[in-house]
């Protein structure tokens, strides 16, 4: 056994933007610190077989499987994956160890499996086995964080029951309105689960893992703001925790806060108060209303009252399951070629939706903005004046919603023509859909004014390219028009376009485009 080399197997995770298949090399990329895969001798195996710890990789991630061999003399090697041999180029590091690497870029299902590395040194032969699998992200979840009161402490714990374990952070802001946007200098982030400083203006908790980032805002009523005439609304699902913070600042401590639900005081275990003096010696009080697990009968108007400030209310609505409310009837728009235009969907939803806009099988990011009437809006302006069918899709944990839009761009027809031995066809995608005329050019009618009505077959919208209609007109050849020039014209309210076709000429058909406005 003393002849066996000392070997080390490591996994290197890369942050990369390349896409490629497995490469046997020391491929240069930005990398994380190597993870020891602890290559151990496999018992009861014929020959010397080392087995590395199983490697789980995210889809599209890039990794390097690396073996460091501490053995005298030269080594040669061969990688085998799914019965295919892959080139192997060992090199030596500064400590004179043999280094063999397999780079897997942009991990896919086809790259998962067993990677065998055969090494031959002057002293011995041995095999190293790596098992690479794609991490099952189907089991991954990212749940919106919720709040709990810390036992025996005036503090909130932020919890997100997610897989893999998320990083939880508090996002705090002490100024009003716009300056509390995520990247504003007024925003402070604290990467911890427990928060003791609960007096700030805006308090959110966010959880993030491989699936993204979800945030929950601590619903707050500020009694120092003049009450809105319309009451804010908070949706919750049965079983979720309710947290409402009522905050008031006054010149001295001579004021108190109370919570009522539908004009009845909240029960003792459903609220707790905190107070502090601010820098200018004014008193800040906050009173939390909370229910650890809401039921339908917790629905109603919650009112926070102060002995000095105008009271304020919020409507808490408890629903059995999440919803997305919006009108799903399809909408058609026609716009001019340079007209500014955005699609928009107005919806009310709980929990918050994830959404996409799709056109021509391409998905576009979807932004949503809360309106001040309880609805949200998503707009899509990046259509680049391409006519066709646009799809808005939204979903949350409990509901799905799809809405179709058709965009028509008003423009003059453009005519394309093709001909065969038996017929001539013209196509146009102008909008509004054009009407067609066919004219014969002859000695009698050098200006092509003689209209052809026989043998004409118009097809409106014979093919739909992602919602874009194309109109066509076909002229069946008859003896009367063989050998003549004919003209097909498409016209709509924006203009006319024509093509002239010489019928029955040998070889490719000459087409003469003739645009008439």
């Amino acid at each position: 056994n003393q002849d066996l080399p000392v070997i080390k197997c490591v996994l290197i995770n890369h942050k990369n933007n390349d896409s490629s298949v497995g490469k046997s090399s020391s491929y240069p990329m930005v990398s994380e610190s190597p993870e020891d895969l602890g290559c151990a001798l496999r018992p009861q195996s014929s020959g010397t077989v080392y087995e590395a710890a199983a490697v789980e990789v995210d889809v599209s991630a890039s990794i390097t499987l690396q073996v460091l061999v501490d053995a005298p003399g030269n080594i040669s090697c061969l990688w085998v994956f799914k019965h295919s041999s892959l080139n192997c180029q060992p090199h030596f590091d500064l400590q004179n160890r043999g280094v063999v690497s397999m780079v897997i870029l942009k991990m896919t299902e086809t790259q998962a499996g067993e990677y065998l590395l055969f090494i031959q040194s002057e002293a011995t032969n041995y095999t190293i086995l790596f098992t690479v699998s794609i991490r099952n992200t189907l089991l991954y979840t990212l749940r919106r964080p919720y709040f709990r009161k810390m036992e025996n402490q005036d503090a909130l714990v932020c919890i997100s029951e997610s897989v893999p374990e998320p990083i939880v952070e508090w996002v705090l802001c002490d100024s009003q309105g716009e300056s509390c946007k995520e990247e504003s200098p007024a925003v402070v982030k604290k990467e911890e689960k427990v928060l003791h400083e609960l007096f700030g203006t805006d308090i959110r908790c966010c959880a993030r893992n491989e699936l993204g980032r979800e945030c929950t805002r601590l619903f707050t009523i500020d009694l120092n703001q003049t009450p809105q005439t319309t009451l804010p609304q908070l949706f919750l699902k049965v079983g979720e925790p309710l947290w409402i913070r009522c905050k008031a600042v006054h010149v001295n401590h001579g004021f108190g806060l109370t919570w009522e639900l539908e004009n009845k005081a909240l029960e003792e275990g459903n609220y707790f108060e905190m107070s502090t003096y601010s820098t200018n010696r004014t008193m800040i009080r906050i009173l939390f209303a909370f229910v650890s697990s809401v039921a339908r009968n917790d629905t109603g108007y919650y009112t926070c009252s102060s002995s000095k400030h105008p009271s304020q209310s919020a409507l808490v609505t408890i629903v059995e399951k999440g919803f997305i409310n919006a009108t799903n009837s399809s909408e058609d728009y026609e716009i001019d070629q340079y007209e500014e235009f955005c699609f928009s969907v107005r919806f009310k939803a709980y929990p918050q939706i994830r959404c996409t806009w799709t056109f021509s099988r391409k998905s576009f990011p979807c932004e949503q903005k809360g309106l001040d009437n309880g609805y949200s809006i998503s707009k899509f302006c990046n259509h680049k004046h391409q006519p066709g069918e646009y799809i808005f899709h939204a979903e949350n944990d409990d509901a799905q919603f799809t809405k179709m839009f058709t965009l028509n761009i008003r423009r003059k027809p453009q005519v394309l023509a093709e001909a065969s031995a038996s017929q001539a066809s013209c196509f146009s995608d102008g909008y509004p859909l054009p009407s067609w005329t066919w004219k014969k050019c002859s000695d009698k009618s050098p200006n092509c004014t003689e209209e052809i009505t026989e043998g004409v077959w118009n097809r409106k919208a014979n093919r739909k390219v992602f919602g874009q209609w194309v109109s066509s007109s076909t002229l069946n050849m008859s003896e009367a028009i063989k050998g003549f020039l004919v003209k097909c014209c498409a016209y709509n309210s924006l203009g006319t376009s024509c093509e002239t076709i010489l019928l029955n000429s040998p070889g490719p058909f000459p087409f003469i485009q003739d645009n008439i406005s």
Epitope: N224, T229, T230, L231, P232, T303, S305, S307, K308, S311
Partner: antibody
Framework: QVQLVQSGAEVKKPGASVKVSCKAS????????MHWVRQAPGQRLEWMGF????????KYNEKFKGRVTITRDTSASTAYMELSSLRSEDTAVYYC???????????WGQGTTVTVSS | DIVMTQSPDSLAVSLGERATINCRAS??????????VHWYQQKPGQPPKLLIY???NLESGVPDRFSGSGSGTDFTLTISSLQAEDVAVYYC?????????FGGGTKVEIK
Amino acid sequence: QVQLVQSGAEVKKPGASVKVSCKASGYTFTRYVMHWVRQAPGQRLEWMGFINPYNDDTKYNEKFKGRVTITRDTSASTAYMELSSLRSEDTAVYYCARWRQLGSLDSWGQGTTVTVSS
Amino acid sequence: DIVMTQSPDSLAVSLGERATINCRASESVDTYGSSFVHWYQQKPGQPPKLLIYLASNLESGVPDRFSGSGSGTDFTLTISSLQAEDVAVYYCQQNNEEPWTFGGGTKVEIK
């Protein structure tokens, strides 16, 4: 009990100003936003604006912007509404009314008649 | 501005009978889960008195023969059994949007 007592009737010439007072009692003055509403003969009630006595926030109906000013004196638990550049169509009964967010205008003053006549 | 249209302008009902007053808003007066419409009663020489708030909630101290219903743009005030003291003008009001606006009033009399 809650009471809003307004100042007496006024007769004014066109172009003049009028200031109507509304004294609150029976509750903490700063705890309720105070609104002003007027009712001209044969016309519907018309909202003029409000003041939050706690923080002195005001909001006015665009129709009266620049002509109406609502103020308050917390030590006297009194709200005031001043209307300037009076014209004959400002002849009306002017009311102060206490507003609660969950409810609406739940208590009203008795009204002050303002007559604008040359 | 949101226009509140009441109908009928006047209504004569026998004592003990039901009186129904309608109010239509020129656009929805619902926000979040609430309808921001309120009903007032005004007797001659008196200020208005709040009867119903947020479309259907009875103000404390108001007899339960008064009730309100509706959402969106259409609202109704019902007096289930008219009493002599109910003779007055009734107004609807919205505060979903500024400026707050009132209906033109419905005069209720005894037949």
